[in-house]
Interface confidence: low
C-alpha cells in the first residue's frame, strides 16, 4: 500500500507566440482545480477507461480575476498535494491524465459552471520510494509544470511497496530468514501478512491480504483438499502421488477481489466484477457518490446518494464515458457533405462549406451561375462549386469583360502574318505554306504534305489530325 503524490507547480501560458486568453475576467471571476487519473501499465488506454490505480480531485484554488490589459499569468493554484492512495502493489509503470478545470463563479443559474481548460496525459516509469520526478506538459497554448512521486505507507517498503518492514527486535540482526530493510537498516523485513484465516500449511501469499494455495488445496483460505475428480483439470503439474494432474494456484484462488467482488479468470490474469459502489482492479476503491462531483463537462449526476448505491452520469451532447470525461469526436462521422470542413465547437457542430455549397451540412449545391452574367455574349458554365465563363471570340477574362487580342499569342506559323477580325483572326501565310494557321508546307507539285501516319496505319486510312 502507498500513496501517489502529485504537486502542481504552475499552470499558465506556455512559451512562444499565441498566448492564451486568461480563463477568468472581471465579469466572470473563476478558480482552478485539478483532477488526476492513474492507470497501471504503459498501455494507451482510452480516456474513459477506469482510473484503476485511483483518481483524485484537488481543492479549489484562490479566486482569480483578470487584470484588464494584462497578459495571462501563471494562475493561482490550490494548496496542497493531490494524493491517490493505492492499496496493492505499486505497478512501476503507469499512465496518468491530469485535467485542469475552471470553476466560473459568476451569477450562474444552478450553481457554478465547470469547464475543462486543459488535459495532459503521459506514460511513465516510476519506482516507489524514489525522489520527486518533475515534468512539464503542454496542452495547446497552456503549460503545466508538476512533480510526482510514489511512496509506500508503513510498514510497506520497496520499489513496489510489497515488502513489509518492522523495527528490529535486536540491534545486531534480524530474525531467521529475514533481511534488513534497506535503506532502513534499523528495520527488518516482516513476514507477509496473508489473508486472515489463510491456512499456514497449505496457503501462502505474495502480497498482503492474499491467500494462494499450494498444490492439492483450494478454497478461499486453502483449507479444502482438491478432490480426485480434479485429475481431469488441464492445469498444474503432475502429482507424483496420484499420477494425475492437480490444479496449481490459479489467478482467482483465494479471491483477490475485495469488498465482495466476484473473480473470473481471464487468459492472462483475472477480472473482478465489483458490487455497486466499488471499482478498481480488485474492487478496492470505495464508492464515489454524487456529492463527490464525479461527472465532468456539465454531466448530470443521478443516484449515488450513499456509497452503497452507484451513480450514473448523464452526459451533455459531445461527451461520453462513465464520468463524461471523454469528448466525442463527432467529426469522425464525417457529417459535412461535399468536402465541407467539420468543426466541433463542443456545444455544436459547424460545417465550413466549400464555395458553391451551403446548408448546415453543406448539403445544398448552389447554382454557380445564378446571378452571374458573362459579358459580351459569353456563356456561363457550372463546375466544381465555381462558375466559369466561356467567352465569345475576341473576349476573355473571368467575366468576358476584357477585349482579347487574338494575335497576341502569335498563332500564325512559318512567318505568317496575323490580322484581327470580328470573327476571330486571319493568317496571311508566307509563300510555300498554307492552312488556317499556315501550318502545312505547299509541295512544288501543288499537293499539301499531310502529317505522316502513325505506325500501323497506312497513308490514306481515315484518321484525325489534332
Amino acid at each position: 500500500a502507498g500513496v501517489f503524490e502529485l504537486q502542481i507547480h504552475s499552470f499558465g501560458p506556455g512559451p512562444g507566440p499565441g498566448a492564451p486568453r486568461s480563463p477568468c475576467s472581471a465579469r466572470l471571476p473563476c478558480r482552478l482545480f485539478f483532477r488526476v487519473c492513474l492507470k497501471p501499465g504503459l498501455s494507451e488506454e482510452a480516456a474513459e477507461s477506469p482510473c484503476a490505480l485511483g483518481a483524485a480531485l484537488s481543492a479549489r484554488g484562490p479566486v482569480y480575476t483578470e487584470q484588464p490589459g494584462a497578459p495571462a499569468p501563471d494562475l493561482p493554484l490550490p494548496d496542497g498535494l493531490l494524493q491517490v492512495p493505492f492499496r496493492d502493489a505499486w505497478p512501476g509503470t503507469f499512465s496518468f491524465i491530469i485535467e485542469t478545470w475552471r470553476e466560473e463563479l459568476g451569477d450562474q443559474i444552478g450553481g457554478p459552471a465547470w469547464s475543462l481548460l486543459a488535459r495532459v496525459a503521459g506514460r511513465r516509469r516510476l519506482a516507489a520510494g524514489g525522489p520527486w520526478a518533475r515534468d512539464i506538459q503542454r496542452a495547446g497554448a497552456w503549460e503545466l509544470r508538476f512533480s510526482y512521486r510514489a511512496r509506500c505507507e508503513p510498514p510497506a517498503v520497496g520499489t513496489a511497496c510489497t515488502r513489509l518492514c518492522r523495527p528490529r527486535s535486536a540491534p545486531s540482526r534480524c530474525g531467521p530468514g529475514l533481511r534488513p530493510c534497506a535503506p532502513l537498516e534499523d528495520e527488518c523485513e516482516a513476514p507477509l501478512v496473508c489473508r486472515a484465516g489463510c491456512s499456514p500449511e497449505h496457503g501462502f501469499c505474495e502480497q498482503p491480504g492474499e491467500c494462494r494455495c499450494l498444490e492439492g488445496w483450494t478454497g478461499p483460505l486453502c483449507t479444502v483438499p482438491v478432490s480426485t475428480s480434479s485429475c481431469l483439470s488441464p492445469r498444474g503439474p503432475s502429482s507424483a502421488t496420484t499420477g494425475c494432474l492437480v490444479p496449481g494456484p490459479g489467478p482467482c484462488d483465494g479471491n483477490p477481489c475485495a469488498n465482495g467482488g466476484s473473480c473470473s479468470e481471464t487468459p492472462r490474469s483475472f477480472e473482478c466484477t465489483c458490487p455497486r459502489g466499488f471499482y478498481g482492479l480488485r474492487c478496492e476503491v470505495s464508492g464515489v457518490t454524487c456529492a463527490d462531483g464525479p461527472c465532468f463537462n456539465g454531466g448530470l449526476c443521478v443516484g449515488g446518494a450513499d456509497p452503497d448505491s452507484a451513480y450514473i452520469c448523464h452526459c451533455p451532447p459531445g461527451f461520453q464515458g462513465s464520468n463524461c470525461e471523454k469528448r466525442v469526436d463527432r467529426c469522425s462521422l464525417q457529417p459535412c457533405r461535399n468536402g465541407g470542413l467539420c468543426l466541433d465547437l463542443g456545444h455544436a457542430l459547424r460545417c465550413r462549406c466549400r464555395a458553391g455549397f451551403a446548408g448546415p451540412r453543406c448539403e445544398h449545391d448552389l447554382d454557380d451561375c445564378a446571378g452571374r452574367a458573362c459579358a459580351n455574349g459569353g456563356t456561363c458554365v457550372e463546375g466544381g462549386g465555381a462558375h466559369r465563363c466561356s467567352c465569345a471570340l475576341g473576349f476573355g477574362g473571368r467575366d468576358c469583360r476584357e477585349r482579347a487580342d487574338p494575335c497576341a499569342a502569335r498563332p500564325c506559323a512559318h512567318g505568317g502574318r496575323c490580322y484581327a477580325h470580328f470573327s476571330g483572326l486571319v493568317c496571311a501565310c508566307a509563300p510555300g505554306y498554307m492552312g488556317a494557321r499556315c501550318e502545312f508546307p505547299v509541295h512544288p507539285d501543288g499537293a499539301s504534305a499531310l502529317p505522316a501516319a502513325p505506325p500501323g496505319l497506312r497513308p490514306g486510312d481515315p484518321q484525325r489530325y489534332l
Epitope: Q7, H9, S10, D74, L81, G130, P131, W132, R134, D135, I136, R145, S147
Partner: antibody, heavy 122, light 107 residues
C-alpha cells in the same frame, strides 16, 4: 538579472547545526528548483539535495545527508534555507546554492550563489 | 550511485592548443550529462548541458560530445581565461553526482 546571494561564513562546533540562506532575485522565485552543492577544501563538488520553492514540501535529498539536512523556503523573501545538523569536521566546506535551469527539463545548474564557507572546528 | 571518472586529473597545455577532457560513467547515463567550469575562489559555471547543448554567453570554442558512458568536452583553441577546473555532472539517476574534476593548467 538573476542573482543568488548567500549568507556569510560560519564557524561551528562539532555536533552543532548550521543554517545557510540563499536569497534569489531577478526571476520568478517559485518557478525554479534550487539545489545545494558543497565543496570541501581542495575537493570536488557534492550534490546535497534540492527544493521546489513553489511548494516547500517538494524536496529531494541525497541519501548521504537525508537524516541531517533540511531544506526550506520563505516565499515572502524569496529565500531558500539549507540546515545541516550534527556537524562534524568533515562537513567543513563551501556550500553553494544554485538554480536549476528549466531548459529541456534539465537538472543542470545555470546560476550559482557565491558560496558560504562553513568551518566545523572544536 | 553512478560514479563519474574524469581523465586526465591534470592537463598541461599552452594557449592556442586544443584540449580534450574525458568523463566516463560507471553505467549508461544516456545523454544526461553536463559540464561546468570552476576558477579558484569562484562558483562553478555551466558550460554545456545534455552532452552537447550550448549555453548562451559561452564561447563557441567549447563543445561536448559522447553518449551512454563516454563523454568528451573539447576546447578547440585555448584562451588564457580557459585555464581552470572542469567538472562533469550526471542527472540520469539519484543521487546526482559530479566527476572528480580535470585541472587544466598552463604549460
Amino acid at each position: 538579472q538573476v542573482q543568488l546571494v548567500q549568507s556569510g561564513a560560519e564557524v561551528k562546533k562539532p555536533g552543532a547545526s548550521v543554517k545557510v540562506s540563499c536569497k534569489a532575485s531577478g526571476y520568478t522565485f517559485i518557478s525554479y528548483w534550487i539545489t545545494w552543492v558543497r565543496q570541501a577544501p581542495g575537493q570536488g563538488l557534492e550534490w546535497m539535495g534540492d527544493i521546489y520553492p513553489g511548494s516547500g514540501s517538494t524536496t529531494n535529498y541525497n541519501e548521504k545527508f537525508k537524516s541531517r539536512v533540511t531544506m526550506t523556503r520563505d516565499t515572502s523573501t524569496s529565500t531558500v534555507y539549507m540546515e545541516l545538523s550534527s556537524l562534524r569536521s568533515e562537513d567543513t566546506a563551501v556550500y553553494y546554492c544554485a538554480r536549476e535551469t528549466t531548459v529541456g527539463g534539465a537538472y543542470a545548474m545555470d546560476y550559482w550563489g557565491q558560496g558560504t564557507l562553513v568551518t566545523v572546528s572544536s | 550511485e553512478i560514479v563519474l571518472t574524469q581523465s586526465p586529473a591534470t592537463l598541461s597545455l599552452s594557449p592556442g592548443e586544443r584540449a580534450t577532457l574525458s568523463c566516463r560513467a560507471s553505467q549508461s547515463i544516456n545523454n544526461n550529462l553536463h559540464w561546468y567550469q570552476q576558477k579558484p575562489g569562484q562558483a562553478p559555471r555551466l558550460l554545456i548541458y545534455y552532452v552537447s547543448q550550448s549555453i548562451s554567453g559561452i564561447p563557441a570554442r567549447f563543445s561536448g560530445s559522447g553518449s551512454g558512458t563516454d563523454f568528451t568536452l573539447t576546447i578547440s583553441s585555448l584562451e588564457p581565461e580557459d585555464f581552470a577546473v572542469y567538472y562533469c555532472q550526471q542527472t540520469n539517476s539519484w543521487p546526482l553526482t559530479f566527476g572528480g574534476g580535470t585541472k587544466l593548467e598552463i604549460k
